[in-house]
């Protein structure tokens, strides 16, 4: 009876979320059959988050809005391990907006979710950031340094990476 009511609730949530994400891929967390953690299909999952590579080319502001419509944000990168996971799904000849910007052009970089900007956990290409008018950050590939961050003009269309917490049903 308990399992039946849990399944009914789960199906109800799946139906409710279908208008935003037609399909979810779920896994059971640990041994407790009660907890399913889900990511939209075909998003990828790493630790407690889901990631989506948006191949449409848009400005930083439009890219962030595109993520938020899906219940996500432009990606906030917290660790080297997270970046190493993300780059597995990126194309070397493309650049992707991060959820990192410097709105005032004063080199006060801020993450979109207000995670404190920590200089010790940044992955700028050497010599970057290098222009006060370039107020948005991308991740791209340079043959000399592999994957790293670069500051660019926010209005220049780029691909982007969305990130959201896993959906628990």
């Amino acid at each position: 009876n308990f399992m039946y009511s849990k399944t009914v609730k789960r199906l109800s949530k799946l139906r409710e979320y279908q208008q935003y994400h037609p399909s979810l891929t779920c896994v059971m967390e640990g041994k407790d059959i009660e907890d399913w953690s889900c990511c939209p299909t075909p998003w990828t999952s790493f630790q407690s988050s889901c990631y989506f590579i948006s191949t449409g080319m848009q400005s930083w502001t439009k890219s962030q809005k595109n993520c938020s419509v899906m219940g996500a944000d432009l990606v906030v990168i917290n660790t080297r391990e997270e970046q190493d996971f993300i780059i597995q799904n990126l194309k070397r000849n493309s650049s992707y907006f991060l959820g990192l910007s410097d709105p005032g052009g004063r080199r006060h970089w801020q993450w979109v979710d207000q995670t404190p900007y920590n200089e010790n956990v940044t992955f700028w290409h050497s010599g970057e950031p290098n222009n006060l008018d370039e107020r948005c950050a991308i991740i791209n590939f340079r043959s000399s340094e592999e994957w790293g961050w670069n500051d660019i003009h926010c209005h220049v269309p780029q691909k982007s990476i969305c990130k959201m917490k896993k959906i628990y049903i």
Epitope: Y17, Y20, Q64, K65, V69, M70, V112, K165
Partner: nanobody
Framework: QVQLQESGGGLVQPGGSLRLSCAAS????????MGWFRQAPGKAREFVAA????????YHVDSVKGRFTISRDNAMNTVYLQMNSLQPEDTAHYYC????????????????????WGQGTQVTVSS
């Protein structure tokens, strides 16, 4: 898509009260975290208060704490901002904003995280 319409603004004397309402239509209101922002003439838009989709979590900026209260009625598709002890520095255009979330207790304080915005309602505090 969510459409938002604010109401309840007006002219009030210092120390007075107002209750702002923001009526939502379109998508399922209870799937959205909500926020109130304000913009005084010549200033940037600033965050005021936010509420999670379940109403289980709220946050108010320090300058309004103890005076303003955000709340919501999911059955009425409406979010409210009760404003007491109003001061001249509260004079501004007040906007509500909505953002889809799958987490019952998350709220959002950053302007860039909100997707949908109302047109706003003017609040003037003056004697």
């Amino acid at each position: 898509q969510v459409q938002l319409q604010e109401s309840g603004g007006g002219l009030v004397q210092p120390g007075g009260s107002l209750r702002l309402s923001c009526a939502a239509s379109g998508d399922t209101f209870s799937n959205y975290a909500m926020g109130w922002f304000r913009q005084a003439p010549g200033k940037a838009r600033e965050f005021v208060a936010a509420i999670s989709r379940s109403a289980g979590s709220t946050y108010h900026v320090d300058s309004v704490k103890g005076r303003f209260t955000i709340s919501r009625d999911n059955a009425m598709n409406t979010v409210y901002l009760q404003m007491n002890s109003l001061q001249p520095e509260d004079t501004a255009h007040y906007y509500c904003a909505a953002r889809l979330t799958f987490n019952l207790i998350d709220y959002y304080t950053a302007e860039t995280r909100y997707t949908y915005w109302g047109q706003g309602t003017q609040v003037t505090v003056s004697s």
